[in-house]
């Protein structure tokens, strides 16, 4: 029962990990630049995401502006872009794999084959928590190697973005959400092929009971 | 109108010491990142020094670390440059630079002060 | 230390003439770069920063670029004025170098 408990909160985690990136990396917001023009009195925000900047007004009016071509972007965007996608479909992925080795679905039948598809999905997720990792933290790394640069212009400094403590949070879950997975699964493996019984006797539908197979063929 | 004029430049033997000055007027001296960009008879530029606004911040290149000191007198609104252990290599003019809000780099320049070293 | 390898070291061009300065840095140094212009007898005076944008007052026949490593600064339709040297420099990390410079003449 342990198990089933980790391999729930575990995709729990894991989806609400999803969740966060996708948000990440759809908000303008992983760059913030907070200043007061010199000449013009008025107070401004100015947002950059990977997709958009956006331009937030004093009076609360916002302006965004989706970036034009892709080739004339900074090859730091791009590549933060395409982890970011490529997260996200990883994700996707490691959640069909989990399905397909959840307790409560068919499509495996065979109780190993079923435990080891948890664990790879956990790998996957794990694997998707560090590339969500690699833009967050190398824009957090741009963002304060420029506010420490004399040479950086303030009105060029910016602040970390509510995306990149997204990203962060995001990164965590899948990290964490991915280690129960394994977790479940390698808890469940020192226990033998009977405790998978137990634990997918749900999922196949004329399985018998672990009480019915003969001890000896478990020792 | 930004102003900034060096002066303390002139003729020293190896290994002596000297003090370059720059007066700043037409801004408010303490909002700024301040530096030394010298030019070499070669016309090659260098970067010598930077200082931040408040002063706590100093940054040098390994070719003059230890032997010059830059400080700023935000009262008197001046730069300091105090060079000591000076060697032939540092025969240059001395430009005194001050950074700005909206763009990178060195923005404004003074006229510059002539360093010579040599016996 | 990164270096900046500025070519040519001078240039002839006719007013009018498009020419194109280059500037390659030793290693990756994002868009951390600008361009001065030091006329005959003045101090130097910056042009472009963060590799492509013009500082207020710059004439918009200047323009700056990067490929990768490599950055550009481009001045279209020559004018007499613009007779002078010019310096790209990094500011990516310490210490800030300079490349060595390229002498404009008009023909």
């Known amino acids: 029962m342990a198990s089933t408990g980790l391999q729930i909160l575990g995709i729990v985690l894991t989806l609400l990990g999803w969740v966060n990136a996708l948000v990440s990396c759809a908000l303008p917001m992983w760059k913030v630049t907070a200043f007061i023009g010199n000449s013009i009195v008025v107070a401004q925000m100015v947002w950059e995401g990977l997709w958009m900047s956006c331009v937030v007004q004093s009076t609360g009016q916002m302006q965004c502006k989706v970036y034009d071509s892709l080739l004339a972007l900074p090859q730091d965007l791009q590549a933060a872009r395409a982890l970011c996608v490529v997260t996200l479909l990883i994700v996707l992925l490691g959640l069909l794999v989990y399905l397909a080795g959840a307790k409560c679905t068919t499509c495996v039948e065979d109780r190993n084959s079923k435990s080891r598809l948890v664990l790879i999905s956990g790998i996957i997720f794990v694997i998707s928590g560090v590339l969500t990792l690699i833009p967050v933290c190398w824009t957090a790394h741009s963002i304060i190697q420029d506010f420490y640069n004399p040479l950086v212009a303030d009105a060029q400094k910016r602040e970390l973005g509510a995306s990149l403590y997204l990203g962060w949070a995001a990164s965590g879950l899948l990290l964490l959400g991915g280690g129960l997975l394994c977790c479940a699964c390698s808890s469940g493996g020192t226990q033998g092929p009977r405790h998978y019984m137990a634990c997918y006797s749900t999922s196949v539908p004329h399985s018998r009971g672990p009480s019915e197979y003969p001890t000896k063929n478990y020792v | 109108e930004v102003k900034l004029v060096e002066s303390g430049g002139g003729l020293v033997k190896p290994g002596g010491s000297l003090k370059l000055s720059c007066a700043a007027s037409g801004f408010t001296f303490n909002s700024y990142t301040m530096s030394w960009v010298r030019q070499t008879p070669a016309k090659r530029l260098e970067w010598v020094v930077t200082?931040?606004?408040?002063?706590?911040?100093?940054y040098y290149p390994d070719s003059v670390k230890g032997r010059f000191t830059i400080s700023r007198d935000n009262a008197r609104n001046t730069l300091y440059l105090q060079m000591s252990s000076l060697r032939s290599e540092d025969t240059a003019m001395y430009y005194c630079?001050?950074?700005?809000?909206?763009?990178?780099?060195?923005?404004?320049w003074g006229q510059g002060t002539l360093v010579t070293v040599s016996t | 230390d990164i270096q900046m390898t500025q070519s040519p070291a001078s240039l002839s061009a006719s007013v009018g003439e498009t020419v194109t300065i280059t500037c390659r840095a030793s290693e990756n140094i994002d868009s951390y770069l600008a361009w001065y212009q030091q006329k005959q007898g003045k101090s130097p005076q910056l042009l472009v920063y963060a590799s492509t944008l013009l500082v207020d007052g710059v004439p918009s026949r200047f323009s700056g670029s990067r490929s990768g490593t490599q950055f550009s600064l481009k001045i279209n339709s020559l004018q007499s004025e613009d007779v002078a040297r010019y310096y790209c420099q990094h500011y990516y990390s310490i210490p800030y170098t300079f490349g060595s410079g390229t002498k404009l003449e008009i023909k």
């Open positions: 200082i931040s606004s408040g002063g706590g911040r100093t």
């Open positions: 630079i001050r950074g700005d809000y909206r763009y990178d780099g060195f923005a404004y």
